[in-house]
Interface confidence: medium
């Protein structure tokens, strides 16, 4: 087409050079300027934005460094040079969310739209007499859905950060130590009497250990949506439910419904947020094996959702089965990549902590050395990972996990059958063609179907340059719930995998990124690396990264790309 | 050469139904995401929706939520618009177009020479 676009009967008002012509000559960018049409400097015409446009409405959000906009209205704005705005307001009575379409050449409550070519929504706080305003715009798809108050990186010299840093880091480390040191006698003393209270799969290792290895996992403690930790890992066998008010649905699932609840706080008006999964009677199997799984006190780890209780409730509706836990904002991993186009650092970042919660849950041992179970997920997918407010991930979704217990049989393990979800079930899964006298072979499976996660962050990673729409892996071979005999054709039939671009290896990190999941799709489950080594993989890469003192350059990687790590 | 060529315009009743084609070619039309735009008479462009390059994701102008549905047949090399329960109001020149990147934004770099839809009774 290119020039030939001048053919036939377009108004000369909507003739436009493509990018053949490069640019735009600027006698027909005159021709062009009506507000429904707005061209880049090579040309090509800017499709309006996406963003959330809900009004005003009253909003919850407070005293938190970012919040999400909970709008259900994604908008295409009406004109293409719109942006995506929000205004936090807060008064004596309340404070309200507005979020809207706005033209960034028009003052929008008397405020120039300064930083409207941002990506991100990041508030900066308006004079307004009586009341406090914050307003922020942005221009990339939904940006305003995420408002951030405080942006953790704001300064634009990394030296003076530095150097900030340092000073303040040996100013304050004497009473940091201090600190630090109560904390960890504090919760040597209450993790010591929950032991007693709880009885928990033990070998014989040393108290010692044991006591020093409990207050361990409690530094890695996640940092939960706001959940108090008093009441982590527990089944509520009290007759007396928790105060919980269920909020809004948040999500369904084949077995049970999530809902947003709030946890009341005695009989003040606090109340924590908390999420709660709902199943119903007849889903009792489903809920028991998760409850069982999140009953292990060693389970507890940052990239593993966090778990306060299981109930059992009587409702007007017959009985139902609740498991309490913490409530993370951002949602889940598909609905984030759906909505977000993440950076280098959020990859590796996202990469990291996934690699580190699936190691933990294979792992026979706690990060300090304590003995665990170790549990295979047997479902993983971007649906089953929850975004935590630092941008890490937290595995959910236990119901089909299996805790390999060293005294299970291969007739046990057997009639485990063929769980999980068919887009992201490994070959052998597939084929059923299981080695069942090796329990490795099921950690291998849940490796598979990692790979095929971080492929989905890395399709959305503004690193590798183009950055489609979200699809999830195979979306363009299979209909959206395929069936395990396409899946086959797919991938047993085909030897297919989602497709990794040659542009996306243009970013050295990215490269390794790919090298790495490309390791975790191996056809043969022997070949596959193991979910510690793609974590131990992520840590190079950002040792990497912090040696070179840059975020996203393409240098950052030694011209090799070698990484030492063993399976 | 990058070509679009939309076809399926027409008069219609109101209320009725049509259904809007847009040949592809010149290019990888798996790869990349398309979008409908229209434009009615005397009055500027206005999107209409969008589609993600393998038909997951898909977009929507207020106007036409409900009634309109983009889809696309990507071993044909071709765009869909299923446009139900029309208005005179969506009397318009419907075009095709190609996105292009530039990482975030939604940019569009390529255009059909369009098909007039006329909803009269």
């Known amino acids: 087409m290119g020039r030939g676009l001048l053919r036939g009967l377009w108004p000369l008002h909507i003739v436009l050079w493509t990018r053949i012509a490069s640019t735009i000559p600027p006698h027909v960018q005159k021709s062009v300027n009506n507000d429904m049409i707005v061209t880049d400097n090579n040309g090509a015409v800017k499709f309006p934005q996406l963003c959330k446009f809900c009004d005003v409405r009253f909003s919850t959000c407070d005293n938190q460094k970012s919040c999400m906009s909970n709008c259900s209205i994604t908008s295409i704005c009406e004109k293409p040079q719109e942006v995506c705005v929000a205004v936090w307001r807060k008064n004596d009575e309340n404070i309200t969310l507005e979020t809207v379409c706005h033209d960034p050449k028009l003052p929008y409550h008397d405020f120039i739209l300064e930083d409207a070519a941002s990506p991100k929504c990041i508030m900066k706080e308006k004079k307004k007499p009586g009341e406090t305003f914050f307003m922020c715009s942005c221009s990339s798809d939904e940006c305003n859905d995420n408002i951030i108050f405080s942006e953790e990186y704001n300064t634009s010299n990394p030296d003076l950060l530095l150097v900030i840093f340092q000073v303040t880091g040996i100013s304050l480390l004497p009473p940091l130590g201090v600190a630090i040191s109560v904390i960890i006698i504090f919760y040597c003393y209450r993790v010591n009497r929950q032991q007693k209270l709880s009885s928990t799969w033990e070998t014989g290792k040393t108290r010692k250990l044991m006591e020093f290895s409990e207050h361990c996992a409690i530094i890695l403690e996640d940092d939960r949506s706001d959940i108090s930790s008093t009441c982590a890992n527990n089944i509520n066998h009290n007759t007396e439910l928790l105060p919980i008010e269920l909020d809004t649905l948040v999500g369904k699932g084949r077995f049970a419904e999530v809902y947003k609840a709030k946890l009341k706080q005695n009989t003040s008006e606090q109340f924590e947020t908390v999420a709660v999964k709902i199943f119903p009677y007849e889903e009792y199997a489903s809920w028991k094996t998760e409850k069982d799984i999140f009953s292990d006190i060693n389970l507890k780890h940052e990239n593993i959702l966090q778990f306060l209780t299981a109930e059992e409730r009587k409702t007007e509706l017959g009985k139902q089965y609740w498991l309490i836990t913490a409530f993370h904002a951002k949602g889940n991993l598909q609905e984030y990549l759906t909505r977000h186009v993440i950076s280098w650092e959020d990859l590796r970042k996202l990469g990291s902590s996934l690699a580190r919660g699936i190691a933990h849950l294979h792992s026979d041992h706690t990060p300090c050395g304590r003995p665990k179970m170790p549990i295979v997920h047997r479902d993983l997918k971007s649906s089953n990972i929850l975004v935590k407010n630092d941008l890490t991930c937290c595995l959910c979704d236990f119901g089909l996990s299996l805790r390999l217990d060293p005294t299970l049989s291969v007739d046990d393990l057997a009639n485990s059958g063929q769980v999980g979800t068919a887009r992201y079930m490994a070959p052998e899964v597939l084929e059923s063609r299981m080695n069942l006298e090796n329990v490795e072979s099921f950690k291998q499976t849940d490796v598979y179907s990692m790979a095929l996660v971080l492929w989905e962050m890395t399709s959305r990673c503004n690193a590798v340059g183009e950055v489609k729409d979200y699809e999830p892996p195979f979306g363009s071979k299979v209909r959206e719930h395929p069936c395990v005999e396409s899946m086959k054709d797919n991938v047993l039939r085909d030897r297919g995998r989602p497709e990794i671009p040659s542009f996306w290896l243009n970013h050295q990190g990215i490269q390794m990124v790919c090298e790495t999941l490309t390791e975790c799709w191996d056809h043969d489950p022997e070949a596959r690396l193991t979910a510690q080594c793609v974590a131990e993989r992520f840590s190079e890469l950002e040792h990497l990264d912090r040696l070179s003192g840059r975020s996203c350059s393409e240098e950052k990687i030694p011209e090799d790309g070698s990484l030492n790590t063993t399976k | 050469e990058v070509q679009l060529l939309e076809s399926g315009g027409g008069l219609v009743q109101p209320g009725g139904s049509l259904r809007l084609s847009c040949a592809a070619s010149g290019f990888t039309f798996s790869d990349y995401d398309m979008a409908w735009a229209r434009q009615a008479p005397g009055k500027g462009l206005e999107w209409v929706s969008r589609i993600s390059h393998s038909g997951y994701s898909t977009y929507y102008a207020d106007s036409v939520k409900g009634r309109f549905t983009i889809s696309r047949d990507n071993s044909k090399n071709t765009l869909y618009l299923q446009m139900n329960s029309l208005r005179a109001e969506d009397t318009a020149v419907y075009y095709c177009?190609?996105?292009?990147?530039?990482?975030?934004?939604?940019?569009?770099?390529?255009w059909g020479q369009g098909t007039l839809v006329t909803v009269s009774s």
């Open positions: 177009a190609k996105r292009s990147w530039d990482g975030v934004h939604a940019q569009f770099d390529y």
